[in-house]
């Protein structure tokens, strides 16, 4: 039969930005499920189920939601899909739905602009409204005739303005802001108008650096961001930017000579204090602002499927990595979970006391901070089983050896935990000096002899019910060794032949390890000097053909059978050459 | 030396009986554990049924409730009884002394087989 | 029950060269005493089996030792290092983890 399990997500909506003026007619946020009896899906938006009803705009498609002609006044939000089937639900990561949007330039003329030449000038863009943020080009004159990114020219991709540290005369005219809006599935780009750039005589004094595009005081940013700090002046000469974490040295990738400094994936050692200088011959102007290095909720500790006992007693646990430090909270079947009774929320912390049937289902940890939030899913399933031998039965024939001791373990599937008794034959076994069943239900007989031979059976019960299951308890001969090895010296290039014999219960194999110094050695190494002889069973002979001063140590024989081994050592030494 | 000498085998209509004898000699059958294997005309190797020193005893499931395995400790002598035989019980019947495996037991020393035919 | 695979179940060999039989099993045959219960058998043209190989990698006495035995797990091999003509015949793998034990198909073993 299928088994029976709850709602595992496979597939998960993931945050869309859709452009106002898109051509597409529909969104699609996916969910889909694996789940034995199948999921059947809902959808909430900004927490309210919704009603997908035949012929609306919303559509389930297997479990996906599909919008049709989705507008931002009625659609933008944030979505979340719930799995369900018999075991329980749960909930999928939350799925933001936004518009973007990028609007015209104002139709209006744009003021000439006027600068001496020589000195420094600034050029707004003033983009439209727009979201999300934008990507800036400027136009000089005419397309596609795009301000290179030099050292004296700059266009700042936080306001879109255009920078020239010290103007000349090939700056004369016209200029026109492209601002670009980059959205999942469309690019759109809009011209500002036209200002014109008028130059006046030449200055040609120097003057001093003065920064003009500065980065913020503060910067936060998001582990793994890419982030940018923004730095230009103005002064004649044009200035040299260098840049400097005032808390410790710029990793040697970064670009330190131009305007932008830019950390391709940020960690939390990259947070501190940076200073950006402008330097030229008459002069230095310097900022300072610090990266403010935060992270998205990411898990530490999650929870996993788990079959638990009626009547037994569960801690489960998560934990999160973030900043802000993220706070946790529990879902049971897609609903908030809160302590009450036998259930205890504390924080990461899920305690059931004496689990009850009705505690089986769907568990989800949230955790969260302003930055996101994650699930973690598992099922809890609450057993009630009558004992069962079918998965581990007793063994069926127990060979122990006379003289030593066997342990017989008795473990059938059973919830809660089955009360174990044995017995021999007819007689149940009680503790005694020889005989102990542990609190597991093993059965240890110690200082065995034939008169312990016979049928042992193990009696397991719970309130759902009882089993038993019987092994055979065959007393053995102990294995000993009957020639042991000697130990010997020999010279360098000898061969030497250390004998091992042992006696055994003939209703047993017989394996013949050797080790040297306590490691295994191997004997079917390919052109090794060991060999074993292999006339007689009870024969386990070791030869070292050409000894090398290598093989000189301690020889252990060790002579095993399934219920007991024995063994024996000898000291070879191996001598060399004189001198 | 150690020796397993199989008999009783022969042709059967299907529905009768049969029972095979495994005389040994060089150990004792009732301090061992001994099984009978079998193995289809071209086929291979399917184990039928064990006796332990102890006198329990275990079948496949394909012969259970139709075989019956047993020995004669004064004849040093292992016995087995088919009864209900069926064509797919041909095969030549091996008769093994066993060796202590986490299984039970397994064959190790064989007899060289006696040939069972079950055909109308 | 614990099905035996064999492969290849035909394995020509020219004699001289090396041969190599492959088993596995459905699932591991390592017993909770640490022994892996995996076992070769031979059996030559009209004779009985013949042990050979027991507990993975142990040689019956008087097995020559140009066969041998490895593997662990449910991955196991037999392989004989210079075929020789008496060498013919079927090659068994078997566990004796659990009952029923079983065999795998057989791997007929012929000189080219």
């Known amino acids: 039969s299928q088994t029976t399990f709850g709602p595992v997500f496979e597939d998960q909506p993931l945050s869309v930005l859709f452009p106002e003026e898109s051509t597409e007619e529909q969104v699609l946020l996916a969910c889909r499920a694996r789940a034995s009896p199948p999921a059947t899906y809902r959808w909430k938006m900004n927490g309210t189920e919704m009603k997908l009803e035949p012929g609306s705009r919303h559509q389930l498609v297997g479990g996906n939601l599909v919008i049709m002609n989705p507008t931002k006044a009625q659609d933008a939000g944030v979505y979340q899909c719930l799995a369900s089937n018999p075991v329980g639900t749960v909930v999928s990561r939350e799925a933001i739905l936004r518009f973007g949007f990028l609007q015209e330039f104002s139709k209006e003329e744009r003021d000439p602009v006027k600068a001496h030449e020589g000195w420094g000038v600034m050029l707004p863009c003033n983009p439209p409204a727009h979201y999300p943020g934008l990507s800036y080009r400027w136009l000089l004159n005419e397309f596609p005739n795009f301000i290179p990114t030099d050292g004296r020219h700059f266009v700042s991709q936080t306001t879109g303005n255009l920078y020239i540290a010290r103007t000349n005369a090939s700056d004369l005219g016209n200029y026109s802001c492209l601002a670009t809006s980059h959205m999942d599935f469309s690019t759109k780009s809009v011209f500002s108008k036209f200002a014109q750039l008028n130059l006046a005589a030449e200055d040609t004094r120097l003057f001093a650096p003065s920064i003009k595009a500065r980065f913020p005081a503060e910067t936060y940013a998001l582990v793994g961001q890419q982030v940018t700090l923004e730095c230009f002046a103005f002064g004649n000469p044009v200035p040299r930017i260098k840049w400097r974490k005032v808390d410790g040295s710029l990793s040697p990738q970064w670009t330190t000579a131009e305007p932008t400094l830019q950390i391709p994936s940020v960690s939390f050692e990259d947070e501190g204090t940076y200073e950006c200088e402008a330097e030229n011959s008459k002069g230095r102007d310097t900022v300072q602002g610090r990266i403010i290095v935060q992270a998205q909720p990411e898990w530490l500790k999650v929870i996993s499927d788990t079959e638990a006992d009626i009547g037994s007693n569960l801690r489960w646990g998560c934990a999160a990595a973030g900043k802000p430090r993220p706070t946790v909270r529990w879902l049971r079947n897609g609903e908030p979970l809160a302590s009450q009774n036998r259930v205890e929320v504390l924080a990461g912390d899920l305690r059931f006391s004496k689990l009850s049937l009705e505690d089986s289902g769907m568990y989800q940890c949230v955790a969260e901070n302003k930055h996101g939030t994650i699930y973690a899913s598992a099922e809890l399933a609450v057993q009630a089983l009558a004992p069962d031998f079918r998965l581990n039965p007793v063994r069926r024939l127990i060979p122990a050896a006379r003289g030593g001791e066997i342990l017989i373990p008795c473990q059938p599937r059973a919830a809660p935990k089955a009360v174990v008794l044995w017995s021999k034959g007819t007689e149940i076994l009680v503790n005694s000096s020889r005989v102990t069943v542990t609190p597991d239900g093993t059965l240890i007989i110690r200082n065995i002899s034939r008169s312990d031979e016979g049928k042992y059976t193990c009696f397991a019960e719970n309130f759902m019910g009882k089993a038993n299951s019987t092994g055979i308890l065959s007393v053995r001969d102990a294995t000993k060794i009957t020639l042991a090895p000697s130990s010997a010296d020999i010279n360098l290039g000898d061969n030497l032949t250390l004998q091992c014999h042992a006696s055994h219960d003939p209703t047993m194999d017989l394996t013949f390890t050797w080790t040297l110094d306590d490691f295994p050695i191997d004997f079917d190494k390919p052109g090794g000097h060991y060999r074993r002889t292999n006339v007689k069973e009870t024969i386990g002979d070791l030869t070292i053909l050409n000894a090398q001063l290598r093989h000189g140590g301690k020889y252990t024989c060790m002579a095993q059978t399934v219920v007991d081994s024995a063994s024996k050592e000898a000291t070879v030494l191996v001598r060399g050459p004189p001198g | 030396e150690v020796q397993l000498v199989e008999t009783g085998g022969g042709l059967i209509q299907p529905g009768g009986s049969l029972r095979l004898s495994c005389a040994a000699s060089?150990?004792?059958?009732?301090?061992?554990?001994m099984s009978w294997v079998r193995q289809a005309p071209g086929k291979g190797l399917e184990w039928v049924s064990v006796?332990?020193?102890?006198?329990?005893?275990y079948y496949a499931d394909s012969v259970k409730g139709r075989f019956t395995i047993s020995r004669d400790n004064s004849k040093n002598t292992l016995y087995l009884q088919m009864n209900s035989l069926r064509a797919e019980d041909t095969a030549v019947y091996y008769c093994?002394?066993?060796?202590?495996?986490?299984?039970?037991?397994?064959?190790?020393?064989w007899g060289q087989g006696t040939l069972v035919t079950v055909s109308s | 029950d614990v099905v035996m695979t064999q492969s290849p179940l035909s394995l020509p060999v020219t004699l001289g060269q090396p041969a190599s039989i492959s088993c596995r099993s459905s699932?591991?045959?390592?017993?909770?005493?640490?022994?892996?219960?995996l076992y070769w058998f031979q059996q030559r043209p009209g004779q009985s089996p013949r042990r050979l190989i027991y507990?993975?990698?142990n040689r019956d006495s008087g097995v020559p030792d140009r066969f041998s035995g490895s593997g662990s797990g449910t991955d196991f091999t037999l392989k004989i290092s210079r075929v020789e003509a008496e060498d013919v015949g079927v090659y068994y793998c078997?566990?004796?983890?659990?009952?029923?034990?079983?065999f795998g198909q057989g791997t007929r073993l012929e000189i080219k």
């Open positions: 093994a002394r066993d060796r202590i495996a986490a299984a039970g037991t397994l064959p190790v020393y």
């Open positions: 078997m566990q004796a983890l659990e009952t029923p034990i079983t």
């Open positions: 507990q993975v990698s």
């Open positions: 060089g150990f004792t059958v009732s301090s061992n554990y």
């Open positions: 006796i332990y020193s102890g006198g329990s005893t």
């Open positions: 699932q591991s045959l390592v017993y909770s005493d640490g022994n892996t219960y």
